[in-house]
Interface confidence: medium
């Protein structure tokens, strides 16, 4: 599902982002997970794919090309195109699930034919086919008859699933393992900095023991913790200092309107 | 040290079956972070990716749609190996046809372990 | 498809210089989807590079792989005797997975 890039360099155009981050270079940050993500590339006006570190970076990355989109190109939810009610569903949303062979842990969703809806599975990052959409607007848009869903979505939660650092298995063919449930982090409202500044702070997957620092947006400080090397998420960095630089502006303290990403 | 064993005849007739195995020593066919594959190479095509099957607590494929209505892959657990099966062949069959394996590895992935090849003309 | 086009088709060189193999995907692939093969006559391919830039087991470290998105490098610092061969670059990223034409180093 990735969205075809150009064969060349354009000039940088006069079209203005809609946010100054959407100006910044994509930045894979120090770690070494291997997260597809999206950033909006200024020379070419299109968002486009790169591979995320795990931790740091900037705030030009996006989980879904559908949000890079929304947040960094001028009009683009007034003119993406809906599906006609009536259209016909293409051939590949009859495809049976794919996580495909790679080893991420990337939350998709497809068109289940069963149920007729479209549901969440777990794609590991490549390989996998067609019936796989990066957000479940876009899966229904594409799959799900508009006519037929008005019922809720049939959600597979993320819980069924264990990851042993290698590839998704279903939680039945693991030894008692479950993945713990994160906690609930403070609401949007009370700040305006990198959503990834609210994460809780997460050790990862492997087995070494790297002393990072997260910002606990309760406190407004930012505290130490050990990360095991891989995984996590990105609220995770080297310094005190880069924490606070990272998260510290984000917090209000007086009420305003409005929302930034 | 992983090795693939290829087996199966090198001479088919037109509109026959071409049939192929891969014998797997040092890993598992059942393997939940490999991929087990078949490419075939000739000078007109070059190497061209035919499919694979791997398993995530369930059986996948995946099978390139020039072949796709006349492929099969079929794991064999009890004896650690897979098959190619590919129907109606015509003379544009003939090529060297090789297994691998595909590795996801911390990288990304790539075919690190291939089997001997195994020239098949399709000839009457 | 996502279509690999390798350049040049043949490269001549002598042992000890620098062979720059590139391959151009039609499509971005980013960068942990790319792997180089080295093929010789009567054998099959050998994995060199995957996810661009990292090298198989045992391959030299002479052997460097570059690039993300749409053009990657296959880089031999210093041409051994046992290095002419045809290389292969092949995408991992989508199905179909698909190889280039190759690229032949040959001897000068």
């Known amino acids: 599902l990735s969205e075809e890039a150009d064969d060349t360099d354009s000039e940088l155009g006069s079209m203005k982002p809609l946010h100054t981050f959407c100006a910044m270079k994509a930045d894979d940050g120090p770690c070494k997970a291997m997260i597809r993500s999206y950033f909006f590339n200024m020379y070419t006006h299109q968002c486009e794919e790169f591979i995320y570190g795990g931790c740091e970076g900037n705030e030009n990355r996006f989980d879904t090309l559908e949000e890079c989109k929304k947040t960094c190109i001028p009009g683009y939810e007034k003119t993406a195109v809906k599906a006609a009610s009536g259209a016909e569903r293409p051939d590949f949303c009859f495809l049976e699930e794919d996580p495909g062979l790679c080893r991420g842990y990337m939350k998709r969703y497809l068109y289940n034919n069963q149920t007729k809806q479209c549901e969440r599975f777990v794609y590991g990052g490549c390989l996998g086919n067609r019936n796989n959409f990066e957000t479940l607007d876009e899966c229904k848009k594409i799959c799900e008859n508009p006519v037929h869903s008005p019922s809720p979505v049939n959600e597979v939660q993320m819980s069924d699933y264990v990851t042993d650092g290698n590839t998704v298995t279903d939680r039945s063919t693991v030894n008692n393992i479950v993945v713990p449930q994160s906690p609930k982090v403070p609401r949007r409202r009370d700040y305006r900095g990198r959503p990834w500044c609210l994460q809780p702070a997460d050790s990862g997957l492997c087995k070494a023991s790297e002393r990072r620092f997260y910002y606990n947006s309760a406190t407004g400080k930012c505290h130490r913790f050990n990360y095991t090397g891989c995984g996590g998420n990105n609220n995770n960095f080297t310094t005190r200092r880069r924490c606070l630089r990272s998260c510290k502006t984000g917090l209000i303290k007086n009420k305003s309107k409005g929302v930034v990403k | 040290q992983v090795q693939l064993q290829q087996s199966g005849p090198g001479l088919v007739k037109p509109s026959q079956t071409l049939s192929l195995t891969c014998a797997i020593s040092?890993?598992?066919?059942?393997?939940?972070?490999?991929?087990w594959g078949w490419i075939r190479q000739s000078p007109g095509r070059g190497l061209e990716w035919l499919g694979m099957?791997?398993?995530?607590?369930?059986?996948?494929?995946s099978y390139a749609v020039s072949v796709k209505s006349r492929i099969t892959i079929n794991p064999d657990t009890s004896k650690n190996q897979f098959s190619l099966q590919l129907n109606s062949v015509t003379p544009e069959d003939t090529a060297v046809y090789y297994c691998a394996r595909t590795m996801s590895k911390y990288g990304g992935p790539g075919m690190d372990v291939w089997g001997q090849g195994t020239l098949v003309t399709v000839s009457s | 498809d996502i279509v690999l086009t390798q350049s040049p088709a043949t490269l001549s060189l002598s042992p000890g210089e620098r062979a720059t193999l590139s391959c151009r995907a039609s499509q971005n692939i980013g960068s942990n989807y790319l792997a180089w093969y080295q093929q010789k006559p009567g054998q099959a391919p050998r994995l060199l590079i995957y996810?661009?830039?990292t090298r198989a087991t045992g391959v030299p470290a002479r052997f460097n792989g570059s690039g993300s998105g749409t053009d990657f490098t296959l880089t031999i610092s210093s041409l051994e005797p046992e290095d002419f061969a045809v290389y292969y670059c092949?995408?991992?990223?989508?199905?179909?997975?698909?190889f280039g034409q190759g690229t032949k180093v040959e001897i000068k």
């Open positions: 996810g661009a830039s």
């Open positions: 040092g890993d598992s066919v059942s393997s939940n972070s490999a991929a």
């Open positions: 092949q995408q991992l990223n989508s199905i179909p997975v698909t």
């Open positions: 099957i791997y398993y995530r607590s369930k059986w996948y494929n």
